[in-house]
């Protein structure tokens, strides 16, 4: 076990700013909820503290929540491929830039990190040339999420990983619109961190609304699992 | 997702007592703060009171100290408002907050968990 992995072994409470500047449209959100890495489970909610959100809520999604990867669940005999809790608690930088397909695109830069006991996600985000009858700056949107495989390599010169995976989102009219995200995760600390072989992290989502609430908001329930690498010809032979 | 649920409002006399209690679920106690936030009519919701996770270190709003005392029960998932020596002016629905940053905001816009209040009048 890593020494970032024992933070992971109970609940552990996530905070999440953003800021946010799409086509000029300036927005802010705040998110706060919990993680179980045990189970690979996020439970969040996301108010936009600025008014009504200038884009769709699932286009940040990957930003708010595949950003806190180090609450994924990795299988015991993939412990040692978990770069994103073997950097905690000092944590890490994530960068993307994410292409919607047709349109604009999203830069985000993002530092996840304990702050105490809590796992803060701080993100920083641009968007530019998106079209402002669009299916982003339109909202022509379905407001929920599919599932998708993120694939992870090691990026040995940065000492850290990239990330590479390709979202689709539903759009009103029974068409999809992709979003291409093209992502970078370097340490902050100077600690070992652990670099993985190829796998990939198999991501659920569910998108809800609280009933209560008057603000612009979003719920997630999410479930994140890592795969893609088997057992050791040793384990076969147990 | 994190609900809330308040009880204990009613109606009491100046100088009386109340005890509101603030039921917790769908999210894991111990690692909320938790408060509560009062709205009169035609005013401004504002803070009253909270209590932060584990440790349980507390703040009051200066019009409440040494009348109200807030506590928490982390095995019942239950926060609890004494209030004593209550005035009229303290008439107003009051709504149990939380989040999960280690002290609840006193503002009431940067609070994401609310629940949907409960009435306390005191006549005079």
């Known amino acids: 076990m890593s020494k970032g992995e024992e933070l992971f072994t109970g609940v552990v409470p996530i905070l999440v700013e953003l800021d946010g500047d799409v086509n000029g449209h300036k927005f802010s959100v705040s998110g706060e909820g919990e993680g179980d890495a045990t189970y690979g489970k996020l439970t969040l909610k996301f108010i936009c503290t600025t008014g009504k959100l200038p884009v769709p809520w699932p286009t940040l999604v990957t930003t708010f929540s595949y950003g806190v990867q180090c609450f994924s669940r990795y299988p015991d005999h993939m412990k040692q491929h978990d770069f994103f809790k073997s950097a905690m608690p000092e944590g890490y930088v994530q960068e993307r830039t994410i292409f919607f397909k047709d349109d604009g695109n999203y830069k985000t830069r993002a530092e996840v990190k304990f702050e105490g006991d809590t796992l803060v996600n701080r993100i920083e985000l641009k968007g530019i040339d998106f079209k402002e009858d669009g299916n982003i700056l339109g909202h022509k949107l379905e407001y929920n999420y599919n599932s998708h495989n993120v694939y992870i390599m090691a990026d040995k010169q940065k000492n850290g990983i990239k990330v590479n995976f390709k979202i689709r989102h539903n759009i009103e009219d029974g068409s999809v619109q992709l979003a291409d995200h093209y992502q970078q995760n370097t340490p902050i600390g100077d600690g070992p961190v652990l670099l993985p072989d190829n796998h990939y992290l198999s991501t659920q989502s569910a998108l809800s609304k609280d009933p209560n609430e008057k603000r612009d908001h979003m719920v997630l329930l999410e479930f994140v699992t890592a795969a893609g690498i088997t057992h050791g010809m040793d384990e076969l032979y147990k | 997702d994190v609900q809330l649920q308040e009880s204990g409002g009613g109606l009491v006399q100046a100088g009386g007592s109340l005890r509101l209690s603030c039921a917790a679920s769908?999210?894991?106690?111990?690692?909320?703060?938790l408060g509560w936030f009062r709205q009169a009519p035609g005013k401004e919701r504002e803070f009253v009171a909270a209590?932060?996770?584990?440790?349980?270190?507390?703040d009051y709003a200066d019009f409440v100290k040494g009348r109200f005392m807030i506590s928490r029960e982390n095995a019942k998932n239950t926060a609890y408002l004494q209030m004593n020596s209550l005035k009229p002016e303290d008439t107003a629905v009051y709504f149990c907050?939380?989040?999960?940053?280690?002290?609840?905001?006193?503002?009431?816009?940067?609070?994401?968990?609310w629940g949907q209040g409960t009435q306390v009048t005191v006549s005079s």
């Open positions: 907050a939380a989040s999960y940053a280690r002290r609840l905001s006193t503002t009431a816009s940067r609070v994401l968990y």
């Open positions: 769908g999210g894991t106690f111990s690692i909320l703060s």
């Open positions: 209590i932060s996770r584990s440790e349980g270190s507390t």
